[in-house]
C-alpha cells in the first residue's frame, strides 16, 4: 500500500459545506489530523492557500475526479491515497447534511475515515474498526482508535516518535575534547548529525552550542548497539543503518519492517563481511561504501552495485589513507574520520582541504 | 466520461524532432499526474515520463532523458512531449495515461496512442 | 533489459486457472499493478497496488505480493481473457516507473 514518504504534512480545507459553521468545520478537520497524528510520528499543518498534500472539498454529483457522488445517502465521501496531486485529498459529497452531533452524518466519524485513507490504509473488515466501510454513529467527545485502526496505521509509519532526551544545551565538558575520541558512524539525519559510538550516538544541530545523547535502543527497540556504517538519503527521509552482514531502513525516523536484510542483496561479493563506513554523495546520487582498502559505489536510483567496482580508496581518494572508520556528507565535502581526526574532503577536486580533530564539531 | 485524445504523431528522420500533445477531457486535468507510455511494433510496454499536477516535478526513462522534454498545460487541459533528437528505437505508438488510486478503487485511463515513426 | 521478470507466455485451457509471475528483487516490499492489454487496443488496469481490483473487472482477476515473485491469478479463464499481460511498480519515492517485459496469455 502506499504511504506518505516524509512525515511533515500539509492540509487545506478548499471550501466549506453550508452545513455547519466555518470554525467548527477548522476544529473537526483539526481533531480528526489529531487521531491519527497522536498513534503516528506524523504532524498536520493547514495551509489557507496554494496546494496542500491533503486537499479536502466538498462537492456534488460530478466533481472532477473519475468518481461521482451519488446524492443522498449511499456514499458519502471518499479519498485518494497518498501522493502527488489528487493522491491524498479527501471529498466529501455536499449532498449529505453534515453535523457535529448524531443527526444527519457526522463529519468528524467520516473525516476519520477518509483521512485513514488519505495515510494509506484500506477499507477494514472489523466492525470496530474506524475503517470499515459502513458508517455508523460513535460519540465523538469518546472516540478512540481501534487496536486494530492503531496496528494498521502503525505499520506504515510506525508509532510515535518520543524526542531524545536532551542533556543541557551548553559546550561539551573539557574531558570531552580532551579525548582521543574515534566515531563508529556518522551520518546527518534530516538538519541533525548523529555520531554513532558503541550502544549510544550523540546528536547535533549544527552551529548550535547543544549537544544532546541518546542510546540507540531508547529510540529504535529493534536496531543493535555497535553501528558501523550510517548513510541519510535525506530526499526521501530514508536512513540506512549497517553492522557486520546486516543493514537496517529508518524512514521518516521509524524503523521499516521486513527489516534487517542482508548486504549481499546490496550487491557485495562474499568477501565483504562488514561496510567501515558509508556515504551518500546527493550530487551523484551514489553511495560509496569503504570496506578495508577498497571502496564500493551503488546507483540509488537503479538499486545497483556499480559495475567495475570495488577499487582502492588510496588511488581514487587522493590523499586518504585506510583504515575509514566513518564518513559525513555535509556541505559537498566528505568528512572522513580516521581514529581521533578527520579529513575534509573536496569530491569535486579530489582533494583533502582541511585535518580537524573528530571531535571539532563539538566546539572543541 | 474521461477521453484522452494524442496527436502530432507521423514520419519524421533519424535527429528529427516531433511535439506529441494529448487533449484531456471528463475530468480536473489540474489535479493529477499524467504519463507518457511507448509500445514499439511487437514489443512491450515502456514507461517514458510522467509530469506532475503543477507541472513542477517530472521523470524520464533513461532511454529518453535529455532528448524529450514533458510538459503540460493546465488552462488548455493538454499535455505535451517534445521530442528532439529522434532515433530509430523511438519508433512506437506513444500512449497518454492518467491514474486514480482511491477508497472506491483504482481506475486508469489511456488514449488510443499516436503511431511515431523515426525512419529515413 | 527489465527489473520486472515476465514468462513470455502461459498457456492455459478454459476453465482452469492461469498465474502469471513477475520476478524483482524484494518485489514484495513494492506496490505491484497488472495491465491487460488485447489486441490493437490501449492497455487498462486489472490489479492495482498488488490485489486491489478497479470497478468493471470480474472477481476472477486477482493478485499476491510477496518476497521476489508478484503474482497475477486469473482463474475460470475465458478466451476473452487472452492477451497480453504486464506488470508494473511505481513507487513515490523513486522517479521511475518499470514495465515487465510482458506475458502472452493464450487459451487453447
Known amino acids: 500500500r502506499s504511504r506518505w514518504m516524509k512525515r511533515y504534512l500539509t492540509y487545506r480545507i478548499y471550501n466549506y459545506t453550508p452545513d455547519m459553521k466555518r470554525e467548527d468545520v477548522d476544529y473537526i478537520f483539526q481533531k480528526a489530523f489529531q487521531v491519527w497524528s497522536d498513534v503516528t510520528p506524523l504532524r498536520f499543518r493547514k495551509l489557507h492557500k496554494d496546494e496542500a498534500d491533503i486537499m479536502i472539498l466538498f462537492a456534488f454529483g460530478a466533481h472532477g475526479d473519475f468518481n461521482y457522488f451519488d446524492g443522498k445517502g449511499g456514499t458519502l465521501a471518499h479519498a485518494f491515497y497518498p501522493g502527488p496531486g489528487i493522491q491524498g485529498d479527501a471529498h466529501f459529497d455536499e449532498a449529505e447534511t453534515w453535523t457535529k452531533s448524531f443527526q444527519g452524518t457526522n463529519l468528524f466519524l467520516v473525516a476519520v475515515h477518509e483521512l485513514g485513507h488519505s495515510l494509506g490504509l484500506q477499507h477494514s473488515n472489523n466492525p470496530k474498526s474506524i475503517m470499515y466501510p459502513t458508517y455508523r454513529y460513535l460519540n465523538p467527545s469518546t472516540f478512540r482508535l481501534s487496536a486494530d485502526d492503531i496496528r494498521n496505521i502503525q505499520s506504515l509509519y510506525g508509532a510515535p516518535v518520543k524526542p531524545p532526551s536532551l542533556t543541557k544545551p551548553s559546550s561539551p565538558p573539557s574531558t570531552f575534547c580532551h579525548q582521543s575520541l574515534s566515531f563508529d558512524a556518522v551520518t546527518t539525519v534530516g538538519e541533525k548529525i548523529f555520531f554513532f559510538k558503541d550502544w549510544f550516538f550523540w546528536w547535533k544541530l549544527p552551529g548550535s552550542p547543544a549537544t544532546n545523547i541518546t542510546s540507540i535502543s531508547s529510540i529504535w527497540p529493534s536496531i543493535p548497539s555497535g553501528i558501523q556504517a550510517a548513510y541519510e538519503i535525506e530526499s526521501r527521509n530514508q536512513l540506512f543503518l549497517f553492522k557486520d552482514e546486516k543493514y537496517w531502513l529508518i524512514n521518516n525516523l521509524v524503523p521499516e519492517p521486513h527489516y534487517p536484510r542482508s548486504i549481499y542483496s546490496l550487491g557485495f561479493s562474499a568477501s565483504v563481511k562488514k561496510v567501515d563506513a558509508a556515504v551518500f554523495d546527493p550530487l551523484r546520487q551514489k553511495v560509496y561504501f569503504f570496506v578495508d582498502k577498497h571502496y564500493w559505489r551503488y546507483d540509488v536510483r537503479q538499486e545497483l552495485m556499480d559495475p567495475a567496482y570495488p577499487k582502492l580508496i588510496s588511488t581514487h581518494f587522493p590523499g586518504i589513507k585506510p583504515k575509514i572508520d566513518a564518513v559525513l556528507y555535509f556541505k559537498r565535502h566528505y568528512y572522513i574520520f580516521q581514529g581521533a581526526y578527520q579529513l575534509e574532503y573536496d569530491p569535486l577536486f579530489r582533494r583533502v582541504t582541511k585535518t580537524l580533530k573528530s571531535t571539532s564539531w563539538f566546539g572543541c | 466520461e474521461v477521453q484522452l485524445l494524442e496527436s502530432g504523431g507521423g514520419l519524421v528522420q533519424p535527429g528529427g524532432s516531433l511535439r506529441l500533445s494529448c487533449a484531456a477531457s471528463?475530468?480536473?486535468?489540474?489535479?493529477?499526474n499524467m504519463w507518457w507510455v511507448r509500445q514499439a511494433p511487437g514489443k512491450g510496454l515502456e514507461w517514458v515520463s510522467?509530469?506532475?499536477?503543477?507541472?513542477?516535478?517530472?521523470g524520464y526513462a533513461d532511454s529518453v532523458k535529455g532528448r524529450f522534454t514533458i510538459s503540460r498545460d493546465n488552462s488548455k487541459n493538454t499535455l505535451y512531449l517534445q521530442m528532439n533528437s529522434l532515433r530509430a528505437e523511438d519508433t512506437a505508438v506513444y500512449y497518454c495515461?492518467?491514474?486514480?488510486?482511491?477508497?472506491?478503487?483504482?481506475?486508469?485511463?489511456w488514449g488510443q496512442g499516436t503511431l511515431v515513426t523515426v525512419s529515413s | 533489459q527489465s527489473a520486472l521478470t515476465q514468462p513470455p507466455s502461459v498457456s492455459v485451457a478454459p476453465g482452469q486457472t492461469a498465474r502469471i509471475t513477475c520476478g524483482g528483487n524484494?518485489?514484495?516490499?513494492?506496490?505491484v499493478h497488472w495491465y491487460q492489454q488485447k489486441s490493437g487496443q490501449a492497455p487498462v488496469l486489472v490489479v492495482y497496488?498488488?490485489?486491489d481490483r478497479p470497478s468493471g473487472i470480474p472477481e476472477r482477476f486477482s493478485g499476491s505480493n510477496s518476497g521476489n515473485t508478484a503474482t497475477l491469478t486469473i482463474s475460470r479463464v475465458e478466451a476473452g481473457d487472452e492477451a497480453d499481460y504486464y506488470c508494473q511498480v511505481w513507487d513515490n519515492s523513486i522517479d521511475h516507473v518499470v514495465f515487465g517485459g510482458g506475458t502472452k496469455l493464450t487459451v487453447l
Open positions: 471528463g475530468f480536473t486535468f489540474s489535479w493529477y
Open positions: 497496488d498488488n490485489s
Open positions: 524484494n518485489i514484495g516490499t513494492k506496490s
Open positions: 495515461a492518467v491514474f486514480e488510486y482511491s477508497s472506491s478503487g483504482p481506475q486508469g485511463y
Open positions: 510522467y509530469i506532475y499536477p503543477s507541472g513542477g516535478n517530472t
